[in-house]
């Protein structure tokens, strides 16, 4: 059929909860292409009707929710003007009672459900939530050994659980829970994460490099909306926290009441030798009190700030 078979991806998934997979393969999907999903080499594409339990949503295939019988090989076909590529995705659905103590450990989960914390360091766990824009995600709750996590060593920040001064007792089975809303219906997402510990330095002694900001000022009009990216390069197996702070406080905490200034969701691009991370800060409305205040982007031991300043008056 003239289509290029690219790769096979294996995913282990939990039954009875939503799952989505995005058909992206840069640079192929960055141009003008059409994406169509199929199941088990069927000639009939997956439905695009949003009421269907399994449907295609733009480049995504979305299961609301995943069921036992959904295991199988799915193909997404990427057609460009002069090209055709096919990605094979092998989905295996398992039944797992997260709090069933008679079942030791989890099945052979994909790597994002196995995470490592570094002893004695400030570290974090990530709740991997890959869903299309049509899915609205509520706040994340974190559990360890089936008990909701509390205590001042733990902070929930976007999709991450920050753990300060990691100890040996922090190892074990975790879960992150979130309510997903799609077309008015609510679904529970519960991701189990096995967390192990190590004393080894996660980044081999190298430090993350903040590409931007550069301890610089930005001219911005009072009352405007402003988004500033913090761009960071770091080694691939780093465990550094990346965040924006003001007055030594996470911006989301500092502006907890007004939510006028917020930290965005971290994204990253993977290169051969390093990862490039981006985490932005959004000022919904710049106020006088923001001028002259250093807004610090932190990445592990590295930090850099931006400072807002009023534009110079135009005397023309």
């Amino acid at each position: 059929d003239g289509c290029n078979d690219i790769f096979m991806k294996n995913e282990m998934l939990s039954a009875s909860q939503p799952f989505a997979f995005n058909c992206t393969f840069p640079p192929i999907t960055s141009g003008e292409v059409s994406v169509t999903w199929y199941k088990n080499s069927s000639k009939i594409p997956v439905s695009k009707i949003i009421q269907s339990r399994i449907h295609q949503d733009e480049t995504w295939i979305l299961f609301l929710p995943m069921e036992w019988g959904d295991s199988g090989v799915y193909q997404c076909v990427i057609k460009g003007r002069d090209s055709c590529h096919r990605i094979h995705v092998n989905l295996t659905v398992f039944e797992k009672q997260w709090c069933d103590t008679s079942v030791k450990g989890l099945p052979n989960l994909s790597d994002e459900y196995k995470q490592i914390l570094h002893l004695g360091k400030d570290d974090s766990l990530t709740c991997h939530l890959h869903f299309p824009k049509s899915c609205i995600l509520g706040p994340i709750k974190w559990y360890k050994d089936c008990n909701e996590i509390t205590g001042e060593r733990f902070t929930v920040l976007e999709t991450r659980l920050l753990v300060s001064n990691v100890s040996a007792e922090d190892r074990g089975n975790y879960a992150c829970q979130v309510i997903l809303t799609h077309s008015g219906k609510q679904y529970e997402v519960l991701n189990g994460i096995t967390v192990s510990i190590t004393e080894r330095a996660g980044y081999g002694g190298s430090v993350p490099k903040i590409i931007y900001p550069k301890n610089n000022s930005i001219e911005v009009q009072l009352g405007t909306t402003l988004i500033v990216d913090c761009n960071i390069t770091d080694t691939k197996d780093n465990t550094n926290l990346r965040c924006w702070r003001v007055n030594n406080t996470l911006v989301d905490d500092y502006y907890n009441e007004s939510k006028r200034i917020r930290e965005g969701v971290e994204t990253h691009a993977s290169f051969r030798e390093y990862n490039l991370y981006t985490v932005n800060i959004t000022f919904l409305e710049v106020k006088m009190e923001d001028y002259g205040l250093p807004f610090m982007c932190h990445a592990g031991v590295s930090a850099a700030y931006i400072m807002l300043q009023l534009p110079a008056p135009d005397f023309r």
Epitope: D111, R171, S196, I197, E199, R200, G204
Partner: antibody, heavy 120, light 106 residues
Framework: QVQLQESGPGLVKPSQTLSLTCTVS??????GYWNWIRNHPGKGLEYI?????????YYNPSLKSRVTISRDTSKNQYYLKLSSVTAADTAVYYC??????????????WGQGTLVTVSS | DIQMTQSPSSLSASVGDRVTITCRAS?????MYWYQQKPGKAPKLWIY???NLASGVPSRFSGSGSGTSYTLTISSLQPEDFATYYC?????????FGQGTKLEIK
């Protein structure tokens, strides 16, 4: 059950490169830390280095100029290369990994070891 | 580098004896790991995170210590305990082993 198996030539000539393979079953080398350790005859254990889940490598500084650890995730194998070998590199070479009781540094799973003799 | 010095280097003891092996680190380490090795065999994880016994290790073994001084103790030596024991640290690279303590039958 995690199993590791070393393979490679048992005899290497001086100044040549020692090459060993560790084949892993029961676990993915894209999780955790994958170590090489050696045991000189009649002497103690020496830590050589590791390759991590992301492909990051760490080498013991005493061997750093001569050692390379790499991997092939499609084969679930990782490798040790030690260049410019001398008789002092004669040892039993082990691959090992941790993760026991969620402790990556607790090296619970070991290969059976392979004796490499450096001799002309 | 953190030097790990085990004492004694070798030890002759009898079945039923209480035996203590010491591992001294040249700088503070957070946790100690102990391995048992028998001739011609791969080492076995014996004690991890200073005081936790690995699966299958008899309760007559115990581990303790902090900072620079750690011990492995056998409360009542049994015939199958005769082997070489190594301590190891992962706190600071390079990740060093002790030179080993060979436990022999008197």
């Amino acid at each position: 059950q995690v199993q590791l198996q070393e393979s490679g030539p048992g005899l290497v000539k001086p100044s040549q490169t020692l090459s060993l393979t560790c084949t892993v079953s029961g676990a993915s080398i894209t999780s955790g830390y994958w170590n090489w350790i050696r045991n000189h005859p009649g002497k103690g254990l020496e830590y050589i280095g590791y390759i991590s889940y992301s492909g990051y490598t760490y080498y013991n500084p005493s061997l750093k100029s001569r050692v390379t650890i790499s991997r092939d995730t499609s084969k679930n194998q990782y490798y040790l290369k030690l260049s410019s070998v001398t008789a002092a590199d004669t040892a039993v070479y082990y691959c090992a990994t941790g993760g026991y009781d969620y402790v990556e540094d607790a090296l619970y799973y070991w290969g059976q070891g392979t004796l490499v003799t450096v001799s002309s | 580098d953190i030097q790990m010095t085990q004492s004694p280097s070798s030890l002759s003891a009898s079945v039923g004896d209480r035996v203590t092996i010491t591992c001294r680190a040249s700088s503070n380490v957070r946790y100690m790991y102990w391995y048992q090795q028998k001739p011609g065999k791969a080492p076995k994880l014996w004690i991890y995170l200073t005081s936790n016994l690995a699966s299958g290790v008899p309760s007559r073994f115990s581990g303790s210590g902090s900072g620079t001084s750690y011990t492995l103790t056998i409360s009542s030596l049994q015939p199958e305990d005769f082997a070489t024991y190594y301590c190891q640290q992962f706190t600071t690279s390079p990740y060093t082993f002790g030179q080993g303590t060979k436990l022999e039958i008197k």
